[in-house]
């Protein structure tokens, strides 16, 4: 059998026998364009493509539409994989989304959506989610039905305000909605009563800014 040399996601990499977490090169569907991603091969059976990670505030997440489209940061640390790649990938097959959260008191929680995809850029990378389970709230902290993506230079929310400018970061803002994992990073003891922080309302409330977050996707049939 011929060895596979290009991979569309971390699940394919895992199934090829490469089972160590780290940075790998992925290829856009139906293209030769490449992108570097962090693959988590340890959590829940492995094969997870990490599409977002926050841990220390080292990367500025108040970025432009183009930057969120193409991705930014470092896959070894804080980064955003890129809306265009994720849209193309999740449009090809059914994917699940796992969101892992850490607070400043040593607690961890997660939300798992059994179907996740992003619409194309023509639909402002609108998020689609179904089937929530997990420990980070019984109600989805990403507004349902899904919202369009907004950035500081592309206001697609449903507020008379500009959510991205005010809350910081690009996100699927509603008006402005119960979450923003791309908000301003606040260190410990400065992380409460901050509406523009890293928020997951149905776990920690409106003013609590989280310590660390990871968004990762994997094929539903993995």
């Amino acid at each position: 059998k011929e060895e596979q040399t290009t991979f569309r996601d971390c699940a394919e990499i895992f199934k090829s026998g490469l089972t160590t977490s780290g940075i790998y090169t992925l290829t856009f569907p139906n293209s030769t364009e490449e992108i570097k991603a962090y693959c988590d091969m340890d959590v829940g059976g492995g094969g997870w493509t990490v599409i977002q990670h926050r841990e220390d505030g080292s990367v500025d997440f108040q970025r432009t539409w183009k930057e969120y489209k193409e991705g930014f940061g470092s896959p070894l640390g804080e980064y955003w994989l890129g809306n265009e790649f994720v849209s193309q990938l999740t449009g090809q097959h059914r994917y699940v989304l796992k969101i892992q959260l850490k607070d400043w008191e040593g607690n961890e929680a997660h939300s798992l959506y059994d179907h996740f995809y992003l619409a194309g850029e023509e639909s402002n990378y609108r998020i689609h989610l179904t089937g929530l389970t997990g420990t980070a709230g019984k109600i989805s902290s990403i507004s349902q039905p899904g919202s369009d993506f907004s950035t500081k230079d592309s206001d697609n929310d449903k507020c008379i305000c500009k959510c991205s400018q005010m809350l910081s970061g690009g996100w699927w803002f509603d008006a402005c909605g119960p979450s923003n994992l791309n908000g301003q990073y606040y260190p410990q003891k400065q992380n409460t009563n901050k509406f523009n922080g890293i928020k997951w309302y149905y776990w920690k409330g409106s003013g609590y800014s989280l310590k660390a977050t990871t968004m990762m996707i994997r094929p539903a049939d993995f």
């Epitope: 305000c161 509603d174 008006a175 402005c176 901050k194 523009n196 922080g197 409106s206």
Partner: antibody, heavy 122, light 112 residues
Framework: EVQLVQSGGGVVQPGRSLRLSCAAS????????MHWVRQAPGKGLEWVSY????????YYADSVKGRFTISRDNAKNSLYLQMNSLRAEDTAVYYC???????????????WGQGTLVTVSS | DIVMTQSPLSLPVTPGEPASISCRSS???????????LNWYLQKPGQSPQILIY???NRASGVPDRFSGSGSGTDFTLKISRVEAEDVGVYYC?????????FGQGTKLEIK
């Protein structure tokens, strides 16, 4: 389109009661904190009361504490203000107002009802 | 309670001319998140108030760009670059940093 439609105002004698209602539409009512603000004839604006999205947090102005009760019914998309022991100085146009931002972020009012006049007079 | 003081209380303006309203607070309105919890509202004759500026300097959607807000801490200003007839009404500043929220006395803008 966001709409806040008020009802329940009128003329009432001092010491009596009145209940104001505010029917919300065009947005997810259960996600927003709500307020009552009043304006005495020819005067400025005065905040009266606040209730959080779930109803778990409530605040009152000192001038109405113990006499007014704010409540909400998220199933009916409605906000209420029960006003007891009314005084002449409570005469005002009462406005319901929605927080600018959802999920109990208190920064100000994004939308206002049309107002309802409460006149307390013997 | 935080006391909000506006000036002037009356502001006659010629159409096409600029206008400026000052608002001072008895305590700083600068939150640790970097925002000033100061909003501006306009109440046109016979109407409910409407939001113009939120968090000090952010113009609400649908508000003409001739309106701008500035300032930080305790001193804030609402500017209208070119006053139009439809801008008449009473302008209020409001602080949302502490409960109870409090308003300025209002500034009545009228056309000369």
């Amino acid at each position: 389109e966001v709409q806040l439609v008020q009802s329940g105002g009128g003329v009432v004698q001092p010491g009596r009661s009145l209940r104001l209602s505010c029917a919300a539409s065009g947005f997810t009512f259960s996600s927003y904190g709500m307020h009552w603000v009043r304006q005495a004839p020819g005067k400025g604006l005065e905040w009266v009361s606040y209730i959080s999205s779930s109803g778990s947090t409530i605040y009152y102005a000192d001038s109405v504490k113990g006499r007014f009760t704010i409540s909400r019914d998220n199933a009916k998309n409605s906000l209420y203000l029960q006003m007891n022991s009314l005084r002449a100085e409570d005469t005002a146009v009462y406005y319901c107002a929605r927080d600018l931002l959802d999920y109990d972020i208190l920064t100000g009012y994004g939308y206002w009802g049309q107002g309802t006049l409460v006149t307390v007079s013997s | 309670d935080i006391v909000m003081t506006q000036s002037p209380l009356s502001l006659p303006v010629t159409p096409g001319e600029p206008a400026s309203i000052s608002c001072r607070s008895s305590q700083s309105l600068l939150h640790s998140n970097g925002y000033n919890y100061l909003n501006w509202y306009l109440q046109k004759p016979g109407q409910s108030p409407q939001i113009l500026i939120y968090l000090g300097s952010n113009r609400a959607s649908g508000v003409p760009d001739r309106f701008s807000g500035s300032g930080s801490g305790t001193d804030f200003t609402l500017k209208i670059s070119r006053v139009e007839a439809e801008d008449v009404g009473v302008y209020y500043c409001m602080q949302g940093l502490q409960t109870p929220p409090t308003f300025g006395q209002g500034t009545k803008l009228e056309i000369k």
